[in-house]
């Protein structure tokens, strides 16, 4: 949905935010290309991008909210990825320099696409509350109240080290989304019936 | 294979009636939304209606008052009940599955169609 | 509802030829889908979530585009790709097709 407008109808609204899920699990829109255009699509490489426990909520977690609880960590678990993002698209070599180094420009096209993506999935989460009649939830656009700030990275000379927990951070979120979607296809056919 | 075959068109008057059918096979209709999508002779595509695996039913506003979308899950069969028929839903209905258990509102799989005349 | 336009209407190109289809909505969509119909057959899905390529299709049909702005392109045209091209949206209800770009034998 396009910010600010909201869709009134309660299916279309769900398919739309788990078409958005399914595709946001998928590694190859986001972590994959991370990885070729940092250099670390390498084996021994590979595996250090291990996703840091603790970082996003569990399916358990996510499982255990009811669908006001979870549409609101949902937002607030968001609001942290667009931060990171931000900090790790400030952090990626330029198109020219990509293309002197023989890497793919559309790694770094998808790259830029991930926080578009977000930010258009917070929006329906958003309407969906609005939706359910969620008075609580902030606007998709404002940081959500007690919203957690995002894990400030160690500070570190280590440009390699930056690039890990980069990589980390990624396959954690593409964990979180596959969590958030199966949770999604778990819910009902109307806005007043839940089937957990 | 997955499939569906549309059944039931036929020549009709303005203002009847007329039940379409369609025999779903290769997959069950609990686990997926299937539509109905019609086209008009020489013209373009509209979408008409969906049943979602636990029976929900969404319309296009357009047809919500004369048409009826319905399944028997035992016989895995999807239906449109058509009424107050006009010379303008004269059209070849098809019916397509949405292509998985999530509520998405385009088409994987389409049947072949059933032409539909409403004509005195 | 969300209206699609399709351009060209008709687009009369040769076999091995690249093909450039347009669909542009009256409000930006989040994702477009096409689908291929021949004449006196059901239409068939090409590519979903915009870029996609729904399974079974060739590698020479590609999908672009976002907000309202989207393209179907064929790059080395097939005797069999001269059919009727439509998109299709469900950002928004109901679910809206273009009227359809025509690809015909020049």
């Known amino acids: 949905a396009a910010m600010g407008s909201c869709s009134k109808e309660y299916r279309m609204l769900l398919g739309q935010l788990q078409k958005q899920t399914d595709l946001m699990q998928d590694t190859s829109r986001l972590l994959d290309p991370y990885i070729r255009i940092q250099g670390l699509d390498i084996p021994k490489l590979r595996e250090h991008c291990r996703e840091s426990p603790g970082a996003f909520p569990s399916e358990e977690t996510l499982r255990g909210l009811g669908r006001r609880g979870f549409l609101q960590t949902l937002n607030a678990t968001l609001g942290r990825v667009l931060h990171r993002l931000a900090d790790l698209e400030q952090h990626l070599p330029k198109a020219q320099d990509l293309e002197r180094s023989g890497l793919n420009i559309e790694d770094l096209e998808k790259l830029q696409m991930a926080r578009p993506n977000v930010l258009g999935l917070r929006n329906n989460v958003y309407c969906m509350a609005q939706l359910l009649d969620n008075s609580d939830m902030t606007e998709p656009t404002k940081a959500g109240r007690g919203t957690p700030q995002p894990p400030t990275p160690t500070p570190t000379s280590d440009v390699f080290q930056r690039k890990l927990e980069g990589c980390s951070f990624l396959r954690g979120y593409h964990r979180f989304m596959h969590s958030v979607g199966r949770v999604f296809s778990k819910w009902g056919e109307s806005p007043n019936r839940s089937r957990r | 294979q997955v499939q569906l075959v549309e059944s039931g068109g036929g020549v009709v008057q303005p203002g009847r009636s007329l039940r379409l059918s369609c025999a779903a096979s290769?997959?069950?209709?609990?686990?997926?939304?299937v539509h109905w999508v019609r086209q008009a002779p020489g013209k373009g595509l509209e979408w008409v209606a969906v049943?979602?695996?636990?029976?929900?039913?969404d319309y296009n506003a357009a047809f919500m008052s004369r048409f009826t979308i319905s399944k028997d899950n035992s016989k895995n069969t999807l239906y449109l009940q058509m009424n107050s028929l006009r010379a303008e839903d004269t059209a070849v209905y098809y019916c397509?599955?949405?292509?998985?258990?999530?509520?998405?509102?385009?088409?994987?799989?389409w049947g072949r169609g059933t032409l539909v005349t409403v004509s005195s | 509802e969300i209206v699609l336009t399709q351009s060209p209407a008709t687009l009369s190109l040769s076999p091995g030829e690249r093909a450039t289809l347009s669909c542009s909505g009256s409000?930006?969509?989040?994702?477009m889908y096409w689908y291929q119909q021949k004449p006196g057959q059901a239409p068939r899905l090409l590519i979903e979530?915009?870029?996609n390529l729904a399974s079974g299709i060739p590698a020479r049909f590609s999908g672009s585009g976002s907000g309202t702005d989207y393209t179907l392109t064929i790059s080395n045209l097939e005797p069999e790709d001269f059919a009727v091209y439509y998109c299709?949206?469900?950002?928004?209800?109901?679910?809206?097709f273009g009227q359809g770009t025509k690809l015909e034998i020049k």
């Open positions: 397509a599955k949405s292509p998985n258990s999530n509520f998405y509102w385009y088409f994987d799989v």
């Open positions: 290769g997959f069950s209709l609990t686990n997926y939304g």
């Open positions: 049943i979602w695996r636990g029976g929900s039913t």
């Open positions: 409000s930006s969509v989040s994702y």
């Open positions: 979530d915009t870029s």
């Open positions: 299709q949206q469900w950002s928004s209800y109901p679910p809206t």
